[in-house]
Structures are given as structure tokens and as C-alpha cells.
């Protein structure tokens, strides 16, 4: 009779990660007797995948029934791929010894290519705010995704940033990869409204490239302009003088008032209105009782803004 | 799974024609699709596909003149105005499940004629 | 734009020839090349997909090789059913466009 052959008809398949890998493997003979064992790799390092006699193997199924008397396929199913599966599987068969079986035929052995999709891209911002006219740097982070081939595109308000650096890492193969990114942007002080969007596009993707975004109201501090007016009087002995606090991003605000470098009076910012990009401004108005200066009085408006170093204004108030 | 073409006909230069493609057995929300044509003893030609999202990309010798979308079940090659060189028979096409570099499933196509 | 030769543009084999049909791109495609089956009158049929892997239904006397830019789609052993035209089909993951080959007619000797 013919010596028994181990046929693996696929040499390579390839699957999405998550799904199932069918390997295919036939025996043309019953003969010799003994057991059939399935291993990723070959030679002393070798993994063993299934072994039909024994052990436990959750995600392999086999495709035949191998208890019927005459059955010649061993093709097995594993489950829920990852790209950690990704290799050469073996479909072995071993003659019956004793105490051990021993090796007796390999079929060619199947190449399983696994194709993983990018993870969503995260993007994130520098630790502290910065002011409009500084630069800062973004990351973008995608992992997971098999082949190695991706493309990543960095964009602000939709249009497309060229000042980046992009590595796929590993260098070498592996069986997944991952991509890391870092852009320049230079704010502005319209920038509260801004977005910067890294879009990843990979083989796997059926939709449109995957997006991160990172929303620049959470990096940029718009520092606020202070002006100190004096309006008409209101009554006998009484000046209103206002304190106009005018596109400032983030709301955090304190000012305090002085009259001739003493405190008079600090409040925290409340009822702000927003502009239409997104900064926001708000009014301090302090009314002054002439008749208690006999002097000229130096009338100042403090201002800290988001925990930063004290602006001011001040203003010199005519006593006559 | 299935996909069939409609619409194809003998149209008149510079009149608009809209193609169809029918599918079933998937959703066309799962699959990016693609749009190729094939002129008579000629080779096959990539015209453009539509991501799953119902985003158009297209070849770049297109230059406006066709425009493809879809609806839940169907997916439309709308020519704005045809040309003699556009003679030819559309197909379209479904990418694989593994990705989008290689189409697995084609419509049988459907023929279209441009003449006065 | 990505260019696909395909070369020859026509051959003649005999049942039971090994045919060989290469392809080659202007610029690297890694491995993203698929070959196509046309019969008159019909549609495409996809046989090989990621350069190299048989898609499901397709006789295994089908095979495919290379990466980069040199590829070759191989029938073993010609069968009757083989004699149609055979297109190759590159994806280019940048520019995220597709180019097919010219196309090779193989003919009954």
C-alpha cells in the first residue's frame, strides 16, 4: 500500500482578527496507526496547537468527527483570532509507540496571516495651557493593526497640518503594530473653537479613516485686556469707575480692586458673556465716594487670570 | 449575497444617466463599494467607490463628472453628461471582508451606449 | 498615479501547460495585488488576493507570489475552463486608489 501522506492543501490563509481560521489537513492512508497533533512553527520550539488524544484546547474545534472508524480529515477551527496567532501551522502525524508516540509525517504546513484593524486613534494635548503665538505639540496614538502599512493625516479646522513626525512601530515583523504621531501647532487667540483631528486610514477599514480629536479650548489660555474708564458722575460725591475684562479663555477670573495700592474690593467673575469665538468677557465697576479722598486717588484693577502672575490698569482719579 | 446593475442604456451626448446597483444577502452599510467599467475589447477601469459611511472617493481621471452615493440598499453612478468614451459596461463591485484592496463579489454589469 | 504592466498581453497553452502571467508596478504596492479571471461577456472572478492567498472556491492548480513590485500569477496545469482573460489589480494604501493591468488573454494553441 502507499505511504501515507499528510496534505495540507492551503499554503496560506489569511483572516480578520476576530473571526475564525479553518486549517485544512487530510491523511490519504489509516495506516500507520496513531494520533494526529497540530503545532505553529516547526522544530524543537514548536507550539504544540491541538493534540487529538489529549489536553485541553478551548478555541480549536475539529471540523470532522475523529472517533469514526475511518476518518481522514483533521482540519481544525480556531476561534476568535488575534494577530498573536499569525504563523505556520503544522498538521503532524505520529505512529503509536510506547511509551511515546513518535513523529512520523508533516504536512507542508499553512501560513496564517492575520489582518487587524487600528485601534481608535487618542489624541492628546500638552499638560498646561499655553498662550496664543506658542507652539505646542499634539500626540496621536493607534495600536493593534496588522499589515503594517497606515497612513496618518494631522488636521486643524479641517485643514491639513504638515509639521509632524510619524513612527510605526516595530521596526521589523511583527504580528501587530502601532503608530505613534507628533504635531506642532502654533495657537492663535481664535483657537477656543479650534480642533485638531488625526485620522488614520489602514487596509482594514471599511468606513472612512478612523479620527481622534483633541479639542483646543482645553490647551489654549487667553490672556484678558483691561481697560479702566470712568464714567458720569452718578450722584454728589460719587464716580463710577468700570473695569472692562475683554477676551480672556479659560472663565477662571479674580480682580480685585485698589484704591491707592489698598485693597477695596475682590470678587470672583460671574454672569460672563461669551463672544462668538469662544472667549469671553466680563465688567467690574466700583463706585467711589469722593468726598472721603481729599487727594487725588490712583484707582487700580488687578486681574488673575487662570492661576497666572496679576495683570492691571490703573486709573487716577481727579479730586477737585 | 448579490449585487446587480440597472440603468444602462443608449443615451445621447451630454445628457445625464444614473446607474443603480442593487444588493442583497449584506448591508451596504458593512462594505465599502466600488464603481469599474470596461470598454468594448478593452481593459477593466476603476471609477470610484463609496466608504460604508456614504463617503465618495474617486479615480482621479473623473474630474466631477461622475458622482456615486447610495441608499440603504442600493448604490448609484450618476454620469452628468456623457460622452462617447464612456461607452462601455459598468460594473460594481464589493471589497472583501478582510479589507479594502481587493473586490470579491461583481454585479454581471450593465451596458451603456453613448451616441447621436 | 500607479501604473500596472502586465505582461504578455496574450499567450497560447495547451491543456495541461504551466502558464505564467507577471505583473509589475511603477512604485512599491507592498503586497496589495489581486488577479482576476474575465470569460467574454461576464464579470470579473477574483482568484488571488494579498498577492499570494487563494480565495475560497478556487482551484489550487491557481497561485500567486511576490510583494513590492514584481508579481506572477501561475496556473500549474492549464484546464479547458482556464482559457479567459486574466487582469492584475493593485491598492495603493497612500493614495488609496486602485490600478488594473492591461490584461492577459490566454488562448487555446
Known amino acids: 500500500e502507499e505511504e501515507l501522506q499528510v496534505i495540507q492543501p492551503d499554503k496560506s490563509i489569511s483572516v480578520a482578527a476576530g473571526e475564525s481560521a479553518t486549517l485544512h489537513c487530510t491523511v490519504t492512508s489509516l495506516i500507520p496507526v496513531g494520533p494526529i497533533q497540530w503545532f505553529r512553527g516547526a522544530g524543537p520550539g514548536r507550539e504544540l496547537i491541538y493534540n487529538q488524544k489529549e489536553g485541553h484546547f478551548p478555541r480549536v474545534t475539529t471540523v470532522s468527527d475523529l472517533t469514526k472508524r475511518n476518518n481522514m480529515d483533521f482540519s481544525i477551527r480556531i476561534s476568535n483570532i488575534t494577530p498573536a496567532d499569525a504563523g505556520t501551522y503544522y498538521c503532524v502525524k505520529f505512529r503509536k509507540g510506547s511509551p511515546d508516540h513518535v513523529e512520523f509525517k508533516s504536512g507542508a504546513g499553512t501560513e496564517l496571516s492575520v489582518r487587524a484593524k487600528p485601534s481608535a486613534p487618542v489624541v492628546s494635548g500638552p499638560a498646561a495651557r499655553a498662550t496664543p503665538q506658542h507652539t505646542v505639540s499634539f500626540t496621536c496614538e493607534s495600536h493593534g493593526f496588522s499589515p503594517r502599512d497606515i497612513t496618518l493625516k494631522w488636521f486643524k479646522n479641517g485643514n491639513e497640518l504638515s509639521d509632524f513626525q510619524t513612527n510605526v512601530d516595530p521596526a521589523g515583523d511583527s504580528v501587530s503594530y502601532s503608530i505613534h504621531s507628533t504635531a506642532k501647532v502654533v495657537l492663535t487667540r481664535e483657537d477656543v473653537h479650534s480642533q485638531v483631528i488625526c485620522e488614520v486610514a489602514h487596509v482594514t477599514l471599511q468606513g472612512d479613516p478612523l479620527r481622534g480629536t483633541a479639542n483646543l479650548s482645553e490647551t489654549i489660555r487667553v490672556p484678558p485686556t483691561l481697560e479702566v474708564t470712568q464714567q458720569p458722575v452718578r450722584a454728589e460725591n460719587q464716580v463710577n469707575v468700570t473695569c472692562q475684562v475683554r477676551k480672556f479663555y479659560p472663565q477662571r477670573l479674580q480682580l480685585t480692586w485698589l484704591e491707592n495700592g489698598n485693597v477695596s474690593r475682590t470678587e470672583t467673575a460671574s454672569t460672563l458673556t461669551e463672544n462668538k469665538d469662544g472667549t469671553y468677557n466680563w465688567m467690574s465697576w466700583l463706585l467711589v465716594n469722593v468726598s472721603a479722598h481729599r487727594d487725588d486717588v490712583k484707582l487700580t484693577c488687578q486681574v488673575e487670570h487662570d492661576g497666572q502672575p496679576a495683570v492691571s490698569k490703573s486709573h487716577d482719579l481727579k479730586v477737585s | 449575497v448579490q449585487l446587480v446593475e440597472s440603468g444602462g442604456r443608449l443615451g445621447q451626448p451630454g445628457t445625464p444617466l444614473t446607474l443603480s446597483c442593487t444588493v442583497s444577502g449584506f448591508s451596504l452599510s458593512s462594505y465599502v463599494m466600488g464603481w469599474f467599467r470596461q470598454a468594448p475589447g478593452k481593459g477593466l477601469e476603476y471609477i470610484g467607490i463609496?466608504?460604508?459611511?456614504?463617503s465618495p472617493y474617486y479615480a482621479s481621471w473623473v474630474n466631477g463628472r461622475f458622482t456615486i452615493s447610495k441608499t440603504s440598499t442600493t448604490m448609484d453612478l450618476k454620469m452628468n453628461s456623457l460622452r462617447s468614451e464612456d461607452t462601455a459596461t459598468y460594473f460594481c463591485?464589493?471589497?472583501?471582508?478582510?479589507?479594502?484592496?481587493?473586490?470579491?463579489?461583481w454585479g454581471p454589469g450593465t451596458l451603456v451606449t453613448v451616441s447621436s | 498615479d500607479i501604473q500596472m504592466t502586465q505582461s504578455p498581453s496574450s499567450l497560447s497553452a495547451s491543456v495541461g501547460d504551466r502558464v505564467t502571467i507577471t505583473c509589475r508596478a511603477s512604485q512599491s504596492i507592498n503586497s496589495y495585488l489581486a488577479w482576476y479571471q474575465q470569460k467574454p461577456g461576464k464579470a470579473p472572478k477574483l482568484l488571488i488576493y494579498s498577492a499570494s492567498f487563494l480565495y475560497s472556491g478556487v482551484p489550487s492548480r491557481f497561485s500567486g507570489s511576490g510583494s513590492g513590485t514584481d508579481f506572477t500569477l501561475t496556473i500549474s496545469s492549464l484546464q479547458p475552463e482556464d482559457f479567459a482573460t486574466y487582469y492584475c489589480q493593485s491598492w495603493h494604501y497612500i493614495s488609496r486608489s486602485y490600478t488594473f493591468g492591461q490584461g492577459t488573454k490566454v488562448e487555446i494553441k
Open positions: 463591485a464589493r471589497v472583501g471582508p478582510l479589507g479594502v484592496d481587493y473586490f470579491n463579489i
Open positions: 463609496i466608504s460604508s459611511s456614504g
